[in-house]
């Protein structure tokens, strides 16, 4: 708490300008009017105040707006935003995408802080859903943003927003998240032709079921090994050797390098060795000739 002292003669601030740069902590407290500060917040960023001085300015705004800052002030907080706590931000009602952008710009280059996470949460909840413009903005600043959301939160993403998603935005998503995003992507890109569709859907395929992979194998898509390795193991296991060969096209040779890793390892164990031999890659570990394969899961389903 800053001690209340009278402002020295001639030091009362008439403007928020650089004449305040070297004011001591107590001088700022005594000589800067909070209402003046609120109306001239946009000037603070241009002035090289120290962290300590910014703390004083924040304190003045907190006193003026104990229930939370109005959006007119929030939009111009600039670097003062970095001084806000998640508790401060929870009091805000941010509705403008321009305000969100302005504050995210300030945090650029930093990891997503608790303050930013709280701000985004407040903004998205206020909008009711993660619309395309918001998603566009958030993934531009934080490519990993989508993957930080729970599957439940992702369910509120409308398919139309999927157009804003770039491959790198999905790099850190786990299978549970891709399970939610894949059907939305499928819906969003459904009117595209084969090759264009594959380019768009590729990064979402970690959520694709077996039947969709089988369908893709009929379209000469030439899936790369990196994409194949991210597919759901349970979706890959039912694929035949011929289907995998068609799915990968010229990339099928890469299976040899990945034969010890999932899902390739598990898939190999499910294939007949003589089918694997047709690939000519030297893949080992398939079911030997003459062995009968019982699909117990199918048997249970029938009984």
């Amino acid at each position: 708490e800053v001690e209340k002292t009278a402002c020295p003669s001639g030091k009362k601030a008439r403007e928020i300008d650089e004449s305040l740069i070297f004011y001591k902590k107590w001088e700022l407290e005594a000589c800067v009017d909070a209402a003046l500060l609120a109306t001239q917040m946009d000037r603070v960023n241009a002035i090289p105040f120290t962290y300590e001085q910014l703390d004083v300015l924040k304190h003045k705004l907190d006193e003026l707006y104990p229930q939370g800052y109005p959006e007119s002030v929030i939009q111009h907080l600039g670097y003062l935003f970095l001084k806000m706590s998640p508790e401060d931000i929870r009091k805000w009602n941010v509705t403008s995408l321009e305000t969100l952008k302005a504050l995210l710009e300030v945090n650029k280059g930093h990891e997503m802080s608790p303050q930013v996470a709280t701000l985004i949460d407040r903004f998205v909840k206020g909008r009711g859903q993660l619309d395309k413009d918001t998603l566009d903005t958030l993934t531009a600043f934080y490519p990993g943003y989508l993957c930080s959301l729970s599957p439940e939160e992702l369910s509120s993403v409308p398919p139309s927003s999927i157009w804003a998603v770039r491959p790198q935005d999905l790099d850190t998503c786990d299978p549970r998240q891709l399970d939610v995003l894949y059907p939305k992507a499928r819906l969003a890109f459904q009117n595209m032709n084969g090759s264009e569709y594959f380019v768009k859907i590729q990064s979402f395929l970690g959520g694709a079921p077996t039947e969709d992979l089988k369908a893709l194998s009929q379209q000469n898509v030439s899936m790369d090994l990196a994409t194949f390795m991210k597919l759901r193991t349970d979706a890959v296991l039912p694929l035949t050797v011929a289907e995998v060969q068609k799915l990968l096209g010229p990339h099928v040779e890469g299976l040899k390098a990945e034969e010890r890793h999932r899902p390739v390892r598990d898939w190999i164990l499910r294939q007949r060795q003589d089918d694997l031999d047709t690939l000519g890659l030297g893949l080992q570990g398939g079911i030997p000739n003459g062995y009968l394969v019982l699909d117990l899961s199918m048997q249970e389903a029938l009984s």
Epitope: E18, S19, A46, P48, F49, E52, G78, Y79, L82
Partner: antibody, heavy 121, light 106 residues
């Protein structure tokens, strides 16, 4: 190219005066507060003085207060340090440095090569 | 505010992990920067706001800490990293620097 170039250093007797200049290029000079930082031979860095973008506000370390004057000419993109009543302990390399900007970002993202000031009889 | 760096010098080999600490005499939030200086050259900004990497600085450099205790880490020392490193606080005036840490070849 974004750069700062100091000049004006040299040998001066105790009690003498010297004026350092720093020519800035490649950025909007008037938008940034500027500083002088010095480094005595074999020693660490010491912040000496600063001036606001318009030149209206100045700051001095206690060790130079009353003897040094910082100023700038924004039309010439030049920063100055007028050093009077020089002492042996003022011997140092003097660097001109640009502050990153406002909003608490008072670290130096651009430095000049420095100019050596030697105070000796 | 006084900044105390430790150690004042250290010897290390290429590939070593190097840690330098900077302690402030009072809390300075995350208002700390780290600089690298090579003989006869001007300092170069590496880290600002205690942990943010300046553009163009290799990712082997990292900063951490808040309040009074801060650390600069070089994950795998390279030949070009042998230099003197300084911390600087910008929490309040006057801005101050640490005494420096010289990293030498073992």
């Amino acid at each position: 190219e974004v750069q700062l170039l100091e000049s004006g250093g040299g040998l001066v007797q105790p009690g003498g005066s010297l004026r350092l200049s720093c020519a800035a290029s490649g950025f909007t000079f008037s938008s940034y507060a500027m500083s002088w930082v010095r480094q005595a031979p074999g020693k660490g860095l010491e912040w000496v003085s600063a001036i606001s973008g318009s030149g209206g506000s100045t700051y001095y370390a206690d060790s130079v207060k009353g003897r040094f004057t910082i100023s700038r000419d924004n039309s010439k993109n030049t920063l100055y340090l007028q050093m009077n009543s020089l002492r042996a302990e003022d011997t140092a390399v003097y660097y001109c440095a640009k502050w990153m900007g406002g909003g608490g970002r008072l670290y130096f993202d651009l430095w000049g090569r420095g100019t050596l000031v030697t105070v000796s009889s | 505010i006084q900044l105390t760096q430790s150690p004042s010098s250290l010897s290390a080999s290429v590939g070593d992990r190097v840690t330098i600490t900077c302690r402030a005499s009072q809390g300075i939030s995350s208002a700390l920067a780290w600089y690298q200086q090579k003989p006869g050259k001007a300092p170069k900004l590496l880290i600002y706001d205690a942990s943010s990497l300046e553009s163009g600085v290799p990712s082997r450099f990292s900063g951490s800490g808040s309040g009074t205790d801060f650390t600069l880490t070089i994950s795998s020392l390279q030949p070009e990293d042998f230099a003197t490193y300084y911390c600087q606080q910008f929490n309040n005036y006057p801005l101050t620097f640490g005494g420096g840490t010289k990293v030498e070849i073992k």
